[in-house]
């Protein structure tokens, strides 16, 4: 056969469908690869051909469009299953061609099973709801094109194994599920089952999504730097390790990029000729507020390093903040000599205790990774 532009296996489109449910799958050529649509291609005399490779087989074979009750059919650029079977899993190819032109792409289709509580290997979309924000809705996804607008389906919503009925703050409203006010307890998987008739048969569409309740924009604040702060002085002798944590709290903000960085004498650490390492850790609250900690570490600090300015910076969509760490070189403790000896132990102990850092009144206590002597 003549040459064909082969776009290969489009693994970006990992299509998953439930067993024993209708599925309509559009040929990805017109979605992602070609600059014209099916109608244009059809009127230009191009034909769309479908074939498939079964799971764990290498042999490409035509799709059987002569199954009882037209179980598999093609309509324009859509491949229809009414309904799917488990062994429909495989790689499907759509090819657009005429005598002078050919283009094709393959994509994987996985038919998955679900249990009575709608658990399955299906990858679930996540819908974020703001905590205590007023009425918010989720909509039963990916049901367009399955039945005409003249057909009125029945829609049942579930949370896990349980039909959503008599819930305090969640109300099913057809294709929508309304949350009068969202709380942490509303986190979880929600399933809509759409039931519709077609040619004397009844079909079900099952769609599950994960609801995650997140911090409300009403409560969002600019980044808050908890450390460094005015209550902690980093006092070191040359040769010691300097460790300064920068701990920043970020309110949850939809699609916001949270950033934390250090500057040393106004420059990025990479642009300073000293051996600095920075380790970052990130933790999240239940409402996806974020705490980022970047620990700046200089293994063997010099007296020059102890004169530098160390500033922690943070930025989110709500604003930018910065805070300098108070770094000092330790002054050696004066050696007192008292006639008759003794009497200085307590004083030396006080200086020993303040060898690393000074904690001044109030303030948040953090676990700094310092060596306390």
């Amino acid at each position: 056969s003549e040459r064909c532009d082969d776009w290969g296996l489009d693994t970006m489109r990992q299509i998953q469908v439930f067993e024993d449910e209708p599925a309509r799958i559009k040929c990805p050529l017109f979605e992602h690869f070609l600059k014209f649509n099916y109608s244009t291609a059809h009127s230009a005399g191009l034909t769309l051909i479908w074939y498939w490779t079964r799971q764990d087989r290498d042999l490409e074979e035509p799709i059987n469009f002569r199954l009882p009750e037209n179980r598999i059919s093609k309509e324009k650029d859509v491949l229809w299953f009414r309904p799917t079977l488990l062994n429909d899993t495989g790689n499907y190819t759509c090819m657009l061609r005429n005598t002078t032109y050919c283009s094709k792409v393959a994509f994987p289709l996985e038919v998955v099973q679900k249990d009575s509580c709608f658990n399955s290997p299906m990858k679930l979309p996540v819908h974020k709801l703001y905590i205590e924000y007023g009425i918010q809705r989720i909509t039963c996804p990916n049901v367009d094109g399955y039945f005409p607008s003249s057909v009125k389906p029945t829609i049942t919503w579930y949370m896990g194994c349980y039909k959503i009925q008599n819930f305090n703050n969640v109300i099913p409203e057809g294709m929508n599920l309304s949350f009068l006010i969202a709380f942490i307890s509303n986190n979880g998987n929600y399933t809509c089952v759409v039931t519709y008739p077609e040619n004397g048969r009844t079909f079900h569409l099952t769609r599950t999504l994960t609801v995650k309740v997140v911090g409300s924009p009403k409560n969002a604040v600019p980044p808050v730097i908890h450390s460094p702060n005015d209550h902690v002085v980093y006092e070191k002798e040359p040769g010691e390790e300097l460790l300064i944590p920068c701990t920043v709290y970020f309110s949850f903000l939809m699609d916001s990029r949270n950033e934390v960085w250090w500057t040393i004498d106004g420059k990025k650490p990479d642009d300073i000729p000293i051996d600095v390492t920075i380790n970052e850790s990130i933790s999240h609250s239940r409402t996806e507020d974020e705490t980022r900690t970047q620990i700046l570490s200089i293994k063997k600090v010099t007296s020059e390093d102890l004169k530098r300015s160390y500033v922690c910076h943070a930025r989110s969509a709500k604003g930018e903040v910065a805070k300098a760490a108070t770094v000092k070189q330790k002054v050696p403790a004066p050696r007192y000599t008292v006639e008759g000896g003794g009497g200085t132990g307590g004083l030396n102990d006080i200086f020993e205790a303040q060898k690393i850092e000074w904690h001044e009144g109030g303030g948040h206590h953090h676990h700094h990774h310092h060596h306390h002597h």
Partner: antibody, heavy 122, light 107 residues
């Protein structure tokens, strides 16, 4: 370790009501459902209904609609089953049961209370 | 509602022997079936769910099989503590329904 502890045995007159409690200890943070099941003497198990304490959702078996009310007090991790218009055939052991989450297919009756005997007699 | 029918009503078995209990659903329940054990004066205990998955702490001598409408609970070698009443339950459709039970007694 999650446990369910039910209230003590009751003797009731026909036409009256009974309210059985079921207290959960060691409850997980995730929402869960409390089921109510009854067993008449020498008979099988009969599902009555459920409640999801943290979300308020509930449902009852058709047979008990209008006579049963299942409620919950989240602050004390206690669920209640009230059955009204009692008749002699309501004499049974009433059990509460639960799973760990709302999602465990087949494990919604994972943990059981010890049962409460309700005797309806004139 | 789905009716669950268990057979036999009573099964007499000697210790060490195999016991096979049957449960039939009035319509397909897929693999959404559980088995419970109940001893006199005690609450039921979950043995098997998903037709064949043993619950936590259940000995390997208990096994479940079947799907659709026909299910079996097998106790490979009966121990003295296994003499009890066994119930099947479907959780495919609301309302969830139980069978009437099979009593396994000492022969």
């Amino acid at each position: 370790q999650v446990q369910l502890v039910q209230s003590g045995a009751e003797v009731k007159k026909p036409g009256s009501s009974v309210k059985v409690s079921c207290k959960a200890s060691g409850s997980p943070a995730e929402p869960y459902a409390i089921q109510w099941v009854r067993q008449a003497p020498g008979q099988g198990l009969e599902w009555m209904g459920y409640i999801i304490p943290s979300l308020g959702g509930y449902d009852y078996a058709q047979k008990f609609q209008g006579r049963v009310t299942i409620t919950a007090d989240e602050s004390t991790s206690t669920a209640y089953m009230e059955l009204s218009s009692l008749r002699s055939e309501d004499t049974a052991v009433y059990y509460c049961a639960r799973g760990q989450t709302l999602y465990d297919s087949g494990r919604q009756f994972d943990i059981w209370g010890q049962g409460t005997l309700v005797t309806v007699s004139s | 509602e789905i009716v669950m029918t268990q057979s036999p009503a009573t099964l007499s078995v000697s210790p060490g022997e195999r016991a096979t209990l049957s449960c039939r659903a009035s319509q397909s329940v897929s693999s959404n079936l559980a088995w419970y054990q109940q001893k006199p004066g005690q609450a039921p205990r979950l043995l098997i769910y998903g037709a064949s998955t043993r619950a936590t702490g259940i000995p390997a001598r208990f096994s479940g099989s079947g799907s659709g409408t026909e299910f079996t609970l097998t106790i490979s070698s009966l121990q003295s503590e296994d003499f009890a009443v066994y119930y099947c339950q479907q959780y495919n459709n609301w309302p969830w329904t139980f069978g009437q039970g099979t009593k396994v007694e000492i022969k």
